[in-house]
C-alpha cells in the first residue's frame, strides 16, 4: 500500500524519495511517473534523471529541489491542482539483477481551508505529522524513503486537520 501525502490546491506538493549513491557521486537513473510502478521503468513519466541531468520533464511544475547529486530525488510539484491527485512512482534504477527500487506514493490534493491563522497549532500539526503535512518549500528537512515512513492513515490526518480547523488553526500544507 502507498504512503499518503496531502497538499492543498495552489500549494506545492512534496513527495520524498532518496537513495545513497555508492560510491558517492556514482549516480543511477531515476524516473518519476504518474501511476503505480510497473514491472519496469515508469509509466506516464513526469521526469527522469540521467547522470547529472534532469530530462523528460513533462511540465515546468515538476522539480527536483533537493540535491539529487547526493541521492535526494524527492519530487516537488508546484501549484498543485485536484488533477494532480493520485499515485506517483519513484523508481531508482540501480543496475544489476532485480536491484531497482520502486516506491509508490499517493498524493491527495485537498481544497484550501478558509480559516484564520494560528501558528502555534500549525507547528503542532507539522510536528505530529512531519513527513505527511509539510510547510517548508522543500518539505521535511529529514529525507526518508517511503518504506521507512511512519504508518499514518488519511483518516487520522483529516481527523486532526478538522479538529484544528474547528479551533481556528490554519492548515497550510505544501
Amino acid at each position: 500500500s502507498e504512503v499518503e501525502y496531502i497538499a492543498e490546491v495552489g500549494q506545492n506538493a512534496y513527495l520524498p524519495c532518496s537513495y545513497t549513491p555508492a560510491p558517492p557521486g556514482n549516480l543511477v537513473p531515476v524516473c518519476w511517473g504518474k501511476g503505480a510502478c510497473p514491472v519496469f521503468d515508469c509509466s506516464n513519466v513526469v521526469l527522469r534523471t540521467e547522470n547529472r541531468d534532469v530530462n523528460d520533464r513533462t511540465s515546468g511544475r515538476y522539480w527536483l529541489k533537493g540535491d539529487f547529486h547526493k541521492g535526494d530525488v524527492s519530487l516537488t510539484i508546484e501549484n498543485v491542482t485536484l488533477a494532480d491527485s493520485g499515485v506517483y512512482c519513484c523508481r531508482i534504477q540501480i543496475p544489476g539483477i532485480m536491484n531497482d527500487e520502486k516506491h509508490n506514493l499517493k498524493l491527495v490534493v485537498i481544497k484550501p481551508a478558509k480559516v484564520t491563522p494560528a501558528p502555534t497549532l500549525q507547528r503542532d500539526l507539522t510536528s505530529a505529522f512531519p513527513r505527511m503535512l509539510t510547510t517548508g518549500e522543500h518539505g521535511p528537512a529529514e529525507t526518508q524513503t517511503p518504506g521507512s515512513l511512519p504508518d499514518v492513515n488519511l483518516t487520522q490526518i483529516f481527523t486532526l486537520t478538522n479538529e484544528l480547523r474547528d479551533s481556528g488553526a490554519t492548515i497550510r500544507t505544501a
Epitope: 510497473p38 514491472v39 519496469f40 509509466s43 513519466v45 532485480m98
Partner: antibody, heavy 123, light 108 residues
Framework: QVQLVGSGGGLVKPGGSLRLSCAAS????????MSWIRQAPGKGLEWVSF????????YYADSVKGRFTISRDNAKNSLDLQMNSLRAEDTAVYYC????????????????WGQGTTVTVSS | EIVLTQSPGTLSLSPGERATLSCRAS???????LAWYQQKPGQAPRLLIY???SRATGIPDRFSGSGSGTDFTLTISRLEPEDFAVYYC?????????FGQGTRLEIK
C-alpha cells in the same frame, strides 16, 4: 521493416548449455526493453527474462534464476540468452520480444515477436 | 506473483457471433499494465490490446478490451474465420510478468 529473428536452438542433454540469439532490425534497438518468453509443447506462455535498453537492469523468472543469463549488444542489435544447467522442463519454443520503450509513456505490451527457436532438453 | 485466470478454457462459437473472454487477476492490476495476445498454431503471439483497452497498431476494431482492478475482458464483436485461435492475457504490474493460461476459441 521491424523484425526479430531468433536462432541457436537445438537438442541438448540435461545439464548441458545452449546460447540463443535474437537479431533485431528496423528499429532503434537500444531504445527498447527486450524479453525472452517460452512456450512448452502444448502449454501456455511463460515469461523468462527481460533486460533494459542499456542492459543495466535485468529480471529473471524464479524458474531460471541462476541458470540463465540475458545480455544484449546494442552495437550489433542483438539479444542473447545463455542457458546453463538445462533441465527437461526447459524444453520449449523460445521467443524474443520487443517490450515497452525505455522512454515509453504508458505502453506495456510485447509488440514485436521473433518466430521462435526450439530448445529440446533430453538424454 | 500475480496469477491470471482465464475463462472459459475453451469457447466454441460460429463466425459472426460475439466472443467474450475473461481474465481475472489474483490481485489488483493497474489497467495500464494489462495486455491481450492472439496466437495461432505454429506462430508467435500477436499483441492485440495494451493498457487494458488500447488496440495495438493494425488490430481491427472488432477487438476491444475493458476492465479494471482484477477483472478484465476481451470482446470480439463479430467473429471472422481468422479469429479462431488461442488468446492470452498478460500483466506488467509486478514482477514476474505473468500470462493467463489461455482461452481457446474454436469454430462451433
Amino acid at each position: 521493416q521491424v523484425q526479430l529473428v531468433g536462432s541457436g536452438g537445438g537438442l541438448v542433454k540435461p545439464g548441458g548449455s545452449l546460447r540463443l540469439s535474437c537479431a533485431a532490425s528496423g528499429f532503434t534497438f537500444s531504445d527498447y526493453y527486450m524479453s525472452w518468453i517460452r512456450q512448452a509443447p502444448g502449454k501456455g506462455l511463460e515469461w523468462v527474462s527481460f533486460i533494459s535498453g542499456s542492459g543495466s537492469i535485468i529480471y529473471y523468472a524464479d524458474s531460471v534464476k541462476g541458470r540463465f543469463t540475458i545480455s544484449r549488444d546494442n552495437a550489433k542489435n542483438s539479444l542473447d540468452l545463455q542457458m546453463n544447467s538445462l533441465r527437461a522442463e526447459d524444453t520449449a519454443v523460445y521467443y524474443c520480444a520487443r517490450d515497452g520503450m525505455v522512454r515509453g509513456m504508458n505502453f506495456y505490451g510485447m509488440d514485436v515477436w521473433g518466430q521462435g527457436t526450439t530448445v529440446t532438453v533430453s538424454s | 506473483e500475480i496469477v491470471l485466470t482465464q475463462s472459459p478454457g475453451t469457447l466454441s462459437l460460429s463466425p459472426g457471433e460475439r466472443a467474450t473472454l475473461s481474465c481475472r487477476a489474483s490481485q489488483s492490476v493497474s489497467s495500464s499494465y494489462l495486455a491481450w495476445y492472439q496466437q495461432k498454431p505454429g506462430q508467435a503471439p500477436r499483441l492485440l490490446i495494451y493498457g487494458a483497452s488500447s488496440r495495438a497498431t493494425g488490430i481491427p476494431d472488432r477487438f476491444s478490451g475493458s476492465g479494471s482492478g482484477t477483472d478484465f475482458t476481451l470482446t470480439i464483436s463479430r467473429l471472422e474465420p481468422e479469429d479462431f485461435a488461442v488468446y492470452y492475457c498478460q500483466q506488467y504490474g509486478s514482477s514476474p510478468i505473468t500470462f493467463g493460461q489461455g482461452t481457446r476459441l474454436e469454430i462451433k
